[in-house]
């Protein structure tokens, strides 16, 4: 859980409780064990647009 009083992480990043800061989700490809990668899976890094109405 994000520390109280901190700003939400920007798009494409997720809060790391182990490091007490936002971390880039791109690094999860190389190292998926990192604690913040769970947050990356829950929030896709790029906007998603449906291909149908």
């Amino acid at each position: 859980e994000q520390a109280p009083g901190t700003a939400p992480c920007s798009r494409g990043s997720s809060w790391s409780a182990d490091l007490d800061k936002c971390m880039d989700c791109a690094s999860c490809r190389a190292r998926p064990h990192s604690d913040f990668c769970l947050g990356c899976a829950a929030a896709p890094p790029a906007p998603f647009r449906l291909l149908w109405p």
Partner: antibody
Framework: EVQLLESGGGLVQPGGSLRLSCAAS????????MMWVRQAPGKGLEWVSY????????HYADSVKGRFTISRDNSKNTLYLQMNSLRAEDTAVYYC?????????????WGQGTLVTVSS | DIQMTQSPSSLSASVGDRVTITCRAS??????LNWYQQKPGKAPKLLIY???SLQSGVPSRFSGSGSGTDFTLTISSLQPEDFATYYC??????????FGQGTKVEIK
């Protein structure tokens, strides 16, 4: 100059307790993750425990889980390791070490170590 | 857990020799591999981080290479102060890190 100074080691009987301290100086302590590593006499290095910069997240090796507790006091620039239910196999030199400031990829500064001997 | 295996466990070399120590991971760890030097009665000292980056203040005769599962620490020209034990350490699963068993470099 970055310095880490461990203290609190000594001789303790099996089942006993000990509290180790690691006093940090020469750098701003609060942004850095920290860890404890131990080395049994004549053996290699074994990771023991990790704590996040705020102290809100902690991790332990299976060999000490439920018996050891890592903590820190950022206002005192000090890291701690509370060791309970000590066993003969916990006999080792215990080192504290500082993690990198961007990630915990490496540990760049280490204390000189404090010896813990568990024996009856 | 990821196991780290170093070879050889010990080696004898002379001043000026080129020394190579290898470290193998039980699974791929990308480039998340560090090397430490430890002298008797002293704390470990970081030499190389992320497989090939030289830590500040470490002499350039030390170098690291490798990725995936196989890594190498090379001392291009062994100096008297280099006789020590060397450990590799994986940080792929940080903060759950593991060390190799160590390689002792002795005087021939």
């Amino acid at each position: 100059e970055v310095q880490l100074l461990e203290s609190g080691g000594g001789l303790v009987q099996p089942g006993g307790s000990l509290r180790l301290s690691c006093a940090a100086s020469g750098f701003t302590f609060s942004p850095y993750p920290m860890m404890w590593v131990r080395q049994a006499p004549g053996k290699g290095l074994e990771w023991v425990s990790y704590i996040s910069p705020s102290g809100g997240s902690t991790h332990y090796a299976d060999s000490v889980k439920g018996r050891f507790t890592i903590s820190r006091d950022n206002s005192k620039n000090t890291l701690y390791l509370q060791m309970n239910s000590l066993r003969a196999e916990d006999t080792a030199v215990y080192y504290c070490a500082r993690g990198g400031d961007t990630y915990f990829d490496y540990f760049d500064y280490w204390g000189q170590g404090t010896l813990v001997t568990v024996s009856s | 857990d990821i196991q780290m295996t170093q070879s050889p466990s010990s080696l004898s070399a002379s001043v000026g020799d080129r020394v190579t120590i290898t470290c193998r991971a039980s699974q791929s760890i990308s480039s998340y591999l560090n090397w430490y030097q430890q002298k008797p009665g002293k704390a470990p000292k970081l030499l190389i981080y992320q497989a090939s980056s030289l830590q500040s203040g470490v002499p350039s005769r030390f170098s690291g290479s490798g990725s995936g599962t196989d890594f190498t620490l090379t001392i291009s020209s062994l100096q008297p102060e280099d006789f020590a034990t060397y450990y590799c350490q994986q940080s792929y699963t940080s903060p759950f890190i593991t060390f190799g068993q160590g390689t002792k470099v002795e005087i021939k």
